[in-house]
């Protein structure tokens, strides 16, 4: 291996991970690179052979779809790309150690706000990921993470708020005023990984009361 | 064939520093991660800490963070390791590892001594 | 930090016989992920950088002869040499890659009788 700088070819490799979907990500130095291909391999922490991933090989795209083959969500992953240029130039540049219970990203919960007269009553639906259980079904954010639980913020006013929570999916607030708006946001916490997703926000009226 | 080797080694007074070098041949260096380990005359092997030479990104062994900094050149296919205010106690061979777990293909070493 | 420790210290054994080291950590090194101990074995002789001989404490690295073999699991992990050979004469030393910072025993000298 003769060195040279080849921080032209291929910079940034990392994973993009979100709800558990884990996507290699990659960039090169140049404005554009038309004439360079990259190939993507991984393989799993003290493992010493890397595994050439189908479908990523000699690609001109600049991402690879990880999630299958890092797919366990308990393990510790490294991905790596090499660049080669027409010209016959390559360069060969590896993640950080990747976990995806660590550093996935939670996305807004999906949540059906529904109003009433003198309430709303807001659902989350479980989010599931594309991570399988010994039994082969799909597990949610909940089975992976036990200390998850949703924050509910109604906002009322401009200067009052009312806040429940809780690890159930079923929600009301009440002694709301008839045939008014309300601004509702529901977030996702996991406190033991620190996580917090962004907000689903629903605006929804209180039916008229017709008594 | 894979091969590492250091240099830089030497004399230092206690207090100074030192830079070692250790170059791969045989390999990308951004390709794997590199360690640093450390042997005291007669003595066991003390990991110092690694690098992933693809984006820097560095974990040292508590005992040695703030005084050892690995650092690494993509284009020298060269890891470093600098070391300052050296005390008589880090006298002591120093190997180049290459791996991110167990190490399984090391430098010959570079004897550091610290004395005056 | 994971304490690493050997057992003997050193160990004089006869040209074909069977040499066994033991290696103790203070907390195990099961990894859930695979079910499998990170640990790893190493011999090392006078004035050369050390050899990987074991990883995954039973998995021998390429080109090892086959008399090495490791085993053991959680904290208690053994090193045997089945039939020791005159180049085997070193210092042997296991290390944890459990959790940073990676620690290694004190090592056991292996001389023969």
């Known amino acids: 291996h003769i060195a040279e700088d080849t921080s032209d070819l291929l910079q940034y490799v990392k994973f993009q991970s979100s709800n558990f979907e884990n996507i290699l990500t990659w960039d090169s130095g140049l404005e554009s690179a038309p004439d360079v291909v990259y190939s993507v391999e991984y393989k799993t922490y003290g493992k010493k052979e890397w595994l050439a991933k189908e479908g990523c090989q000699r690609i001109t795209r600049k991402s690879c779809n990880l999630t299958t083959e890092t797919g366990n969500h308990t393990e510790h992953y490294y991905a790596r790309v090499t660049a080669v240029s027409a010209g016959g130039r390559s360069a060969t540049k590896m993640t950080d150690r990747f976990s995806s219970m660590q550093q996935t990203t939670i996305k807004p919960p999906d949540v059906t706000c529904i109003p009433k007269v003198r309430s709303i009553q807001m659902i989350v639906h479980p989010t599931s990921t594309p991570i399988h259980a010994e039994d082969g079904h799909l597990l949610t954010l909940e089975d992976i993470f036990q200390d998850l639980f949703y924050r509910l913020e109604l906002q009322v006013n401009h200067t009052y708020q009312m806040h429940l929570g809780g690890k159930q999916r079923d929600y009301e607030f009440i002694g709301l005023s008839p045939d008014t708006e309300f601004l509702g946001t529901i977030t996702i916490s996991v406190p033991n990984f620190f996580k917090e997703s962004a907000p689903y926000v629903c605006r929804v009226k209180t039916l008229p009361d017709r008594t | 064939e894979v091969q590492l080797v250091e240099s830089g080694g030497g004399l230092v007074q206690p207090g100074g520093s030192l830079r070692l070098s250790c170059a791969a041949s045989?390999?990308?260096?951004?390709?794997?991660?590199m360690n640093w380990v450390r042997q005291a005359p007669g003595k066991g092997l003390e990991w110092i800490g690694e690098i992933n030479p693809s984006t820097g990104t560095t974990t040292y062994n508590q005992k040695f963070k703030g005084r050892f900094t690995i650092s690494v050149d993509q284009s020298k296919n060269t890891a470093y390791l600098q070391m300052n205010s050296l005390r008589a106690e880090d006298t002591a061979v120093y190997y180049c590892a290459r791996f991110d777990a167990y190490f399984d293909y090391w430098g010959q070493g570079t004897l550091v001594t610290v004395s005056s | 930090d994971i304490v690493m420790t050997q057992s003997p210290d050193s160990l004089a054994v006869s040209l074909g016989e069977r040499a066994t080291i033991n290696c103790k950590s203070s907390q195990s090194l099961l990894y859930s992920s695979n079910q499998k101990n990170t640990l790893a074995w190493y011999q090392q002789k006078p004035g050369q950088p050390p050899k990987l001989l074991i990883y995954?404490?039973?998995s021998r690295e390429s080109g090892v002869p086959d008399r090495f073999s490791g085993s053991g699991s959680g904290t208690d992990f053994t090193l045997t040499i089945s039939s020791l050979q005159a180049e085997d004469v070193a210092v042997y030393y296991c290390?944890?890659?459990?959790?940073?910072?990676?620690?290694f025993g004190q090592g056991t000298k292996v001389e023969i009788k």
């Open positions: 045989g390999y990308s260096i951004t390709a794997e991660y």
């Open positions: 290390q944890q890659y459990y959790s940073y910072p990676f620690t």
């Open positions: 995954w404490a039973s």
